[in-house]
């Protein structure tokens, strides 16, 4: 569909005569009839197959025709057609004299024709005007013409229909040749497919509008490239959906069992060294000057009574200092300037001369000690607490604070490691000298039977239509992740075709 446009520009009839040679009275009031036909080698009588158009009286004798496309569209003249433009045509333009206002052929005088021209030729669709001039004996007509496509028609012969749209059926504008040009964010033959967010995973993501990234089941993240781990997975990751691969230091079905208490909780204080010793179990090796299970207690260096001969101990930031009684000196007041003559032995101790009286030694009664028998005996000195227990003086008595796993007055009894039921999933516990051992039931393994090794529910390939199978470790069942276009627990139903149930 298109329009043949004819722009009449100038008509010259200087003598003001008709084709018959008779002059017009008072002048030739000129109008035009136009006939557009299919190409004929010799222009023949018959229908104006591409259309006809007539003008009103445009002038008298010689005149220029004003461009009137803005006001009513009389010039250029419009000859619309609703078929494929063939590229060739025949054009007949007649100039007629109208003495009155009635321009019908039957109302005109018998010799009202002024001139007639006929041209044939090729004409491609385009915006450019072709200028032509036809001269007869007494008249001259200057005109131009072109063929353009109607709205929504494109191509070399206006045969390509293209109507821009931005709706469910497409999102495009039309190129000059009639091909579709997708609006930004759309693609496909009819620009119906949205272009998803850049980087959106091809398989795991999709979109219903441009720059969107919606995730398929089992996937998450801005680009749907992160798998969703098993529900309840605490300290684990996945490479495919519903997995729970434990981070280092974690174990168990949901990676919630702490196998690296030291790193995760840093229980040892004051720069102590931490050693993992099982699930939620650890040992702290204290730096000098500290004690306690977590080395949380600061040891006073004077607690070990380093000062001899009745010297008094003073704690300092970087150690201790002994204040020696008269007659003694040295770091620990170990050197004496006294002799037995000075009665240096306290609490009934007896003095013995040494080195020809230059020195002495005290022999202490029971319950007293020290180079001058100045100290009561420390019941902890003999380190009576076994298995690393900590000895504490409590007045006249003493007591042992035991490390985990030991009991008894002197921490001499080994608590059964199995008492805490450390073996998961019904594993059998065996006490060993240095700990315990779990014997696991079928389907489980690991130090504490925490790792499930049950049969892979996906082994039987239960999912249809190329769906991805994931094993649900907590229930020994499988989960099918359906591809686009399928539904059902095994992805067995195409979308839009409900299952036919037998009842």
């Amino acid at each position: 569909s298109g329009v043949f446009q004819l722009q009449l520009q100038e008509f010259i009839n200087e003598r003001g005569v008709l084709a018959s040679g008779r002059p017009c009275e008072p002048g030739c009031r000129t109008f035009f009839r136009v006939c557009l036909k299919h190409f004929q080698a010799v222009v023949s009588p018959g229908p104006c197959t591409f259309g006809t158009v007539s003008t009103p009286v445009l002038g008298t004798n010689s005149f220029a025709v004003r461009d009137d496309s803005s006001g009513g569209g009389r010039n250029p003249l419009q000859l619309p057609f609703n078929f494929t433009w063939p590229g060739t045509f025949s054009l007949i333009i007649e100039a007629w004299h109208a003495p009155g206002d009635d321009l019908r052929p039957e109302a005109l005088p018998p010799d009202a024709l002024i001139s007639k021209i006929a041209i044939q030729g090729s004409l491609a669709v385009g915006q450019n005007w072709l200028l032509d001039e036809q001269t007869s004996t007494l008249t001259r007509l200057r005109y131009s013409y072109r063929v353009i496509c109607s709205d929504n028609y494109y191509g070399d012969n206006c045969s390509r229909l293209c109507k821009k749209r931005n709706d469910h059926f497409g999102h495009y504008v039309c190129q000059p040749d009639g091909n579709l040009s997708c609006l930004p964010g759309w693609t496909g033959e009819y620009c119906q497919q949205p272009i998803c967010l850049s980087g959106c995973h091809e398989q795991n993501g999709y979109c219903s509008k441009p720059a969107e990234c919606l995730c398929r089941p089992g996937w998450q993240g801005r680009l749907c490239n992160e798998c969703i781990p098993h529900n309840g997975c605490r300290h684990g990751t996945c490479s495919t959906p519903w997995q729970c691969t434990c981070d280092e230091g974690w174990g168990g079905l949901f990676c919630d069992q702490d196998l690296n208490y030291c790193t995760h909780h840093s229980p040892c204080k004051n720069g102590a060294t931490c050693s993992n010793s099982g699930q939620r179990s650890y040992t702290c090796t204290c730096r000098p000057g500290y004690t306690g299970v977590d080395c949380e207690l600061e040891l006073s260096e004077c607690d070990s009574n380093p000062c001899r001969n009745g010297g008094s101990c003073k704690d300092q930031e970087d150690g201790y200092h002994c204040l020696c009684p008269p007659g003694y000196y040295g770091l620990h007041c170990e050197h004496s300037t006294l002799s037995c003559a000075d009665s240096p032995c306290f609490n009934g101790g007896s003095c013995r001369e040494r080195n020809q009286g230059a020195n002495y030694a005290c022999e202490c009664p029971p319950n007293f000690t020290g180079s001058n028998c100045e100290k009561k005996v420390d019941r902890c000195t003999s380190n009576p607490c076994a298995n690393g227990g900590q000895c504490l003086n409590r007045g006249p008595s003493r007591m042992c604070r035991c490390r985990p796993g030991f009991t008894g007055t002197y921490c001499e009894l080994h608590v059964s490691d199995c008492a805490r039921n450390p073996c998961a999933h019904g594993g059998t516990c065996h006490d060993l000298e240095n700990g315990l051992m779990c014997t696991c039931p079928a389907g489980f393994s690991g130090r504490r039977c925490e790792v499930r090794t049950s049969i892979d529910a996906c082994a039987s390939s239960p999912c249809f239509n190329r769906a991805t199978c994931y094993t649900d470790l907590s229930t020994d069942t499988f989960v099918c992740n359906c591809p686009y276009g399928f539904v059902g627990s095994r992805c067995e139903f195409p979308v839009g075709l409900p299952p036919s149930f037998p009842w």
Partner: antibody, heavy 119, light 111 residues
Framework: QVQLVQSGAEVKKPGASVKISCKAS????????IHWVKQAPGQGLEWIGY????????NYNQKFKGRVTFTTDTSTSTAYMELRSLRSDDTAVYYC????????????WGQGTLVTVSS | DIVMTQSPDSLAVSLGERATISCRAS??????????MKWFQQKPGQPPKLLIY???NQGSGVPDRFSGSGSGTDFTLTISSLQAEDVAVYYC?????????FGGGTKVEIK
């Protein structure tokens, strides 16, 4: 009113030529075409061809080409058909008719001219 | 050449009755949606008279009882109510291609 008046009957010998006239009136002669049609006695109509009055362009039926010529005289609004090398089967009534570019068809006809070819 | 075949050759119809004449072209006479088909009436001793042009358009001064129809290769001329003055020979004619050709004619008479 539109009229096409043809010349009178002609009797010719075989091998001779005949020129029939068709005088138009009541319309702009130059704007139209003139057709020529043959009708043998008791027979149907047979198209011979046409001439475009405004530019003299002609179109002949191949069957008559070489023996027929169309001409016009715009000063007298007359069209002519000359048929040469006459044969006995050229005996017929010959009609002129006008036609136009806007497809009404051959809407006005002359009364016909009888040409008899006989030795 | 395009051959035009008319049927029947002759037709006798009662006054006031419908008369139908068919014309078949050896190839389509349509071009750009227009049928290059005409119907003529010829009474004895007279030149032909144009009845129908472009298959279905009535010529100037033609009574309404004459109508034409068809496209492509098959065309029909119908006289809805035959009158005494309609006795004549009717011709179809194509003008799509040179040479223009006529049908053989159909003679219409009163029954």
């Amino acid at each position: 009113q539109v009229q096409l008046v043809q010349s009178g009957a002609e009797v010719k010998k075989p091998g001779a030529s005949v020129k029939i006239s068709c005088k138009a009136s009541g319309y702009s002669f130059t704007a139209y075409y003139i057709h020529w049609v043959k009708q043998a006695p008791g027979q149907g109509l047979e198209w011979i061809g046409y001439i475009s009055v405004y530019n003299g362009a002609t179109n002949y039926n191949q069957k008559f080409k070489g023996r027929v010529t169309f001409t016009t005289d715009t000063s007298t609004s007359t069209a002519y058909m000359e048929l040469r090398s006459l044969r006995s089967d050229d005996t017929a009534v010959y009609y002129c008719a006008r036609d136009y570019d806007y497809d009404v068809g051959m809407d006005y006809w002359g009364q016909g001219t009888l040409v008899t070819v006989s030795s | 050449d395009i051959v035009m075949t008319q049927s029947p050759d002759s037709l006798a119809v009662s006054l006031g009755e419908r008369a139908t004449i068919s014309c078949r072209a050896s190839e389509s006479v349509d071009n750009y949606g227009i049928s290059f088909m005409k119907w003529f009436q010829q009474k004895p001793g007279q030149p032909p008279k144009l009845l129908i042009y472009a298959a279905s358009n009535q010529g100037s001064g033609v009574p309404d009882r004459f109508s034409g129809s068809g496209s492509g290769t098959d065309f029909t001329l119908t006289i809805s109510s035959l009158q005494a003055e309609d006795v004549a020979v009717y011709y179809c004619q194509q003008s799509k291609e040179v040479p223009w050709t006529f049908g053989g004619g159909t003679k219409v008479e009163i029954k």
